[in-house]
Each structure stands twice: as structure tokens, then as C-alpha cells.
Amino acid sequence: DGNSTRSPETNGLLCGDPEENCAATTTQSKRKGHFSRCPKQYKHYCIKGRCRFVVAEQTPSCVCDEGYIGARCERVDLFY
């Protein structure tokens, strides 16, 4: 399923466009709970991966493509 990461923001920021002011703090998480597709406003949230929505927390989570890590799959995995 790839690497799963989650951002803790719950303020509804859209985090996909350049002008968006997203929360800076992020946390890694294992796949727990239930997921649905991320709302459309998060279309570009995951840089190199697929966005999933943590239903219980109403937060976006990224499943990174192979070779990428980070809360938004924004970093190349040097150990890959």
C-alpha cells in the first residue's frame, strides 16, 4: 500500500495551491482507521502519491509512490 503519512491539520485549509498557508507540522502514521477519497480541494496535496482522507479525523493522508517519503510525499527516499 506504500508509505502512509498523515497531516494533523483540521482547519479546512486546502493545501493544494501555491497561495495556501498549510500547517507546517506533520506526523507519520501507520494505516489505521477508515479512509475515503480526499475531497477535490486536496487534489494536489500529495506531491508524489495518492491522497486518502482519514474519515474519523477529517484529515488528508498520503500514500506515497515508491521512492518517496514525507507527509506529502515531497521528499526522495535516499535509501530506496
Epitope: F35, S36, R50
Partner: antibody, heavy 119, light 106 residues
């Protein structure tokens, strides 16, 4: 090829029960969310229930407390247990595969099974 | 939940362009998908994520979504395109379908 095959439909009296089955083949069943969608005679499509690949369930308001969706990944089968059936539940019931998780779209459909609730 | 409204019927002459609308409050903020259903058959996905086309679906099918209206467009409509068409979106952890539009190719 990817295929969904429903069974279990039939004639049942109001207040009765029925269990629908949907046999999946041609893909890794356990990796997908699945849903049931129904269509009353001459009417449009109505989503009934969905079941995520990790067990999360969701229902349309009109069937909550009466219908239960479940799956057996070892048998590649999706189920819909329907209790306290009403005349308005009469419809063709389709099993559909959600692309990846909930919230995407239905990329594979079964041929449907007819449920008739009548005395 | 969001309510999706479609015209009950649309008529088009062969070779012409057919447009089927799906209206809903701020629907442009949601992904909209379109299904084709012919009599006695199961629905078939023809457009997903507003404007993407599954493999095997002819190029004459296209979609758009903005503001309060999503649109399915069939360019150079053929007789075989006569069917019911349904829009669909995901809202508040549930699936919502439009009421359907019967496309008649005159």
C-alpha cells in the same frame, strides 16, 4: 477478466428477509471497497450501502438498521443481508466495485439481481 | 447531502452534439462521474473525475464541471448512444446519483 456476479434475489413478502451475494473474480477483491446500488422498476439509480476494504461500512438513510453489508475475502464474495423488507425495496440490486477507496467511482458492475417485495 | 438534478430527457439528431447537465450546489468543488445505461443492462462508466474517459470509451464522450453545473457532452452522437445517463458524486460519506437523463437519438 474482471467480473461481478450477483445472486440471491427473488420474491419475498413484506417484513421478510433476503441475503444477496456478489461473487467477484479477476481482481484482488480484498483490496477494493465495494457497494450495492439499486434501481426500482422504471426509476433511477440509488446507492444503498458501501463496505471499505478495511471494514468500514456506510448506508443510505432508508436502509439503516434493516440492511447489513459484509464481505468474505476468502470467498471473494460481498453480501447484503436485507431484513424487514418493504415494498419500496423492490428493485434490481447491483454489486459495484469502488475504484480504490470510498469516494471514487464505480468502474465495474454486476448484471444485477431482482428483488421483489410483495404479498 | 448534495442533490443532483438532471433534465429527464434530451433529444439529438445523429451526428449532432448532445449536452446533458447535472446541477447541484457548488458541484464544481466535487468530482463528478457519468454512467451510461441501456435497457436491461448494467450501468457503464463513461466519464470519471469530471472529464476523464475510461479506456474503451469513444472520444466523442467528454465532460466538464464548474460552478453549479457538470456537463456530459457527446459529439457526433450515434444511434448506439441512445440510453439513460446518470451523474454521480460523493458527498458526506455517501454516494449521490442524479435522477437520470434519457437521451433520444432522433
Amino acid at each position: 477478466q474482471v467480473q461481478l456476479l450477483e445472486s440471491g434475489g427473488g420474491l419475498v413478502q413484506p417484513g421478510g428477509s433476503l441475503r444477496l451475494s456478489c461473487a467477484a473474480s479477476g481482481f484482488t477483491f480484498s483490496s477494493y471497497a465495494m457497494s450495492w446500488v439499486r434501481q426500482a422498476p422504471g426509476k433511477g439509480l440509488e446507492w444503498v450501502s458501501g463496505l471499505g476494504h478495511v471494514g468500514y461500512t456506510t448506508y443510505t438513510d432508508s436502509v439503516k438498521g434493516r440492511f447489513t453489508i459484509s464481505r468474505d475475502n476468502s470467498k471473494n464474495t460481498l453480501y447484503l443481508q436485507m431484513n424487514s423488507l418493504r415494498a419500496e425495496d423492490t428493485a434490481v440490486y447491483y454489486c459495484a466495485r469502488d475504484y480504490l477507496d470510498f469516494g471514487y467511482y464505480f468502474d465495474v458492475w454486476g448484471q444485477g439481481t431482482l428483488v421483489t417485495v410483495s404479498s | 447531502d448534495i442533490e443532483l438534478t438532471q433534465p429527464p430527457s434530451v433529444s439529438v439528431s445523429p451526428g449532432q452534439t448532445a449536452s446533458i447537465t447535472c446541477s447541484g450546489d457548488k458541484i464544481g468543488k466535487k468530482y463528478v462521474h457519468w454512467y451510461q445505461q441501456k435497457p436491461g443492462q448494467a450501468p457503464v462508466l463513461v466519464i470519471y473525475d469530471d472529464s476523464d474517459r475510461p479506456s474503451g470509451i469513444p472520444e466523442r464522450f467528454s465532460g466538464s464541471n464548474s460552478g453549479n453545473t457538470a456537463t456530459l457532452t457527446i459529439s457526433g452522437t450515434q444511434a448506439e448512444d441512445e440510453a439513460d445517463y446518470y451523474c454521480q458524486a460523493w458527498d458526506m460519506q455517501s454516494v449521490v446519483f442524479g435522477g437520470g437523463t434519457k437521451l433520444t437519438v432522433l
